[in-house]
Amino acid sequence: IPVIEPSVPELVVKPGATVTLRCVGNGSVEWDGPPSPHWTLYSDGSSSILSTNNATFQNTGTYRCTEPGDPLGGSAAIHLYVKDPARPWNVLAQEVVVFEDQDALLPCLLTDPVLEAGVSLVRVRGRPLMRHTNYSFSPWHGFTIHRAKFIQSQDYQCSALMGGRKVMSISIRLKVQKVIPGPPALTLVPAELVRIRGEAAQIVCSASSVDVNFDVFLQHNNTKLAIPQQSDFHNNRYQKVLTLNLDQVDFQHAGNYSCVASNVQGKHSTSMFFRVVESAYLNLSSEQNLIQEVTVGEGLNLKVMVEAYPGLQGFNWTYLGPFSDHQPEPKLANATTKDTYRHTFTLSLPRLKPSEAGRYSFLARNPGGWRALTFELTLRYPPEVSVIWTFINGSGTLLCAASGYPQPNVTWLQCSGHTDRCDEAQVLQVWDDPYPEVLSQEPFHKVTVQSLLTVETLEHNQTYECRAHNSVGSGSWAFIPISAGAHTHPPDEFLFTP
């Protein structure tokens, strides 16, 4: 650590005195203090001499000697008072800038330590300090306003009592800056805009910040717009608003609009798109397939996306048949607005019944006209099977009828013994019928197919089973010949309740 001679913490001299401050260190040393012309400096290796042969009140201050090469950064300091009876203050600054809640040091250095008891801080023109101004004084450094507030941005003077009268320093302007957390907050409304050519439009760009020093502008396709700015202050924030009013929009007004605000912390921007159209429009679409298949008893939500300008004047869901004249319950229809010009309409169909298959249409209207989007809903059913014994063209024939949706496939099994259902161990023969005869196939209904198995002689200790399956499930019917005739068995487990 460097050493200063004289080795005293402070030195008091009269104006005109000779002052010599010598600093010695291990390596090269340098002096630091308030810049002043009233010194001469002589450096010689590891020592440096700061001297004046005509000290003035302006030499009052703290002088620090440091050793730049010292990794520990040690320093020594001495405070010099030049006590000028006419000049109680040496003011080191015209202005002090701090952030809110920082301590603000107003550097009025007292030139005579004896005057410390009679010092005070005032605002210029003798005005008292604002209430709640908490300050302290150090003869070496000046007045400190603790946790300075924005409202304390004022011009201050330091006052000392000399021979019964107050002597003021030159003034110091304190600027307390608000702590700016980031770039200004922005709003640009609307977020999206559509207008028909010739209509009026308004776009509002506004920015706010705790500090008044920020800029805001609105640009259209990268061209800055010259718009008068409205300024306001409320909720402890400064607000700047730019309003673009267009009486009759045309296609050249369309495009991207950006609201941009900047301050010392950086820049924020937000954008919106303005569409100008020739006439009203109404577009219906769905992300779903318009042809829907759902298993009976399950639920389905039908969703339609609507894009429209101007807004909708009416809309509804309609059931177009074919089963009944019932209409969807209003409580099952739901509308959500994604944004100003886009909406989603949902029809919920829970636990679908056979009579609810068919066409569902969403209709919407605006000044551009009517539009409709129709869904076709087909219900899927597992197969239902029945077998009868009959003679066709004199031949004994087992006739299997299966109905379900999608169209069932049919397989015949012959197995030993009497059983409700053939299992693998019992199976004697298997016949697949790749092309059963379609008896009925109407839209939104089950498909009924018929398969024939010609049997020359019925084996009495055997079972004939017709199995049908589709993507939903399977059904079967066992036929057991008995001496007195034929006996048929639907499987016990088969129970269908939609």
Epitope: E30, W31, D32, G33, P34, P35, S36, P37, H38, W39, T40, L41, Y42, L50, Y63, R64, T66, P68, G73, S75, L92, A93, Q94, E95, V96, V97, V98, Q102, A104, L105, P107
Partner: antibody
Framework: QVQLQESGPGLVKPSETLSLTCTVS????????WSWIRQPAGKGLEWIGR???????KYNPSLKSRVAMSVDTSKNQFSLKLSSVTAADTAVYYC???????????WGQGTLVTVSS | QSVLTQPPSASGTPGQRVTISCSGS????????VTWYQQLPGTAPKLLIY???QRPSGVPDRFSGSKSGTSASLAISGLQSEDEADYYC???????????FGGGTKLTVL
Amino acid sequence: QVQLQESGPGLVKPSETLSLTCTVSGGSISSYYWSWIRQPAGKGLEWIGRIYTSGSIKYNPSLKSRVAMSVDTSKNQFSLKLSSVTAADTAVYYCAREGILGYFDYWGQGTLVTVSS
Amino acid sequence: QSVLTQPPSASGTPGQRVTISCSGSSSNIGSNTVTWYQQLPGTAPKLLIYSNNQRPSGVPDRFSGSKSGTSASLAISGLQSEDEADYYCAAWDDSLSGPVFGGGTKLTVL
């Protein structure tokens, strides 16, 4: 070794505000006085003002109404703002450390700021 | 217009002695010490002389300064080609509470 580096936009439009930052490295910004000096092309040097780490500032009276300085000790930086600029403010702007006798012992390399529309 | 006055140019041949003058007023050079800076082309100024005649470490003793009344001068002896630069005088100005500068002298080594 103390080093100073100026940064900021090289082009400013008339009537706007010129903003520059000086970053100090190789030493602490604390306990020293830091100045801004400018030099118009082919002309002499002009002292703009100085700032101390406590926020104490002295400005050149000829520029005082348009100048603002600030210091950020946590970033080892100090800043200059010059408002309502005109073409006459086009210059190389230097930041420098001001020694106890009022001379400048460490300088930044300078940054050219042009005021033009 | 600079506060301190310097000749715009000066020249000399290698090995020669060249002097650059700087004049001011009682509020600057008359009552305060003078500093000289050297600015090589395309670089920042560099401290050359302070307190009228003191050289920082690393500055050759070919450079010397003096002051008399409200004027000061910089002398360069044994002129070398690397001395070709702009030279600025500066002094504290009491009315400014800060430094003022001369307009600079362009030294050409012929």
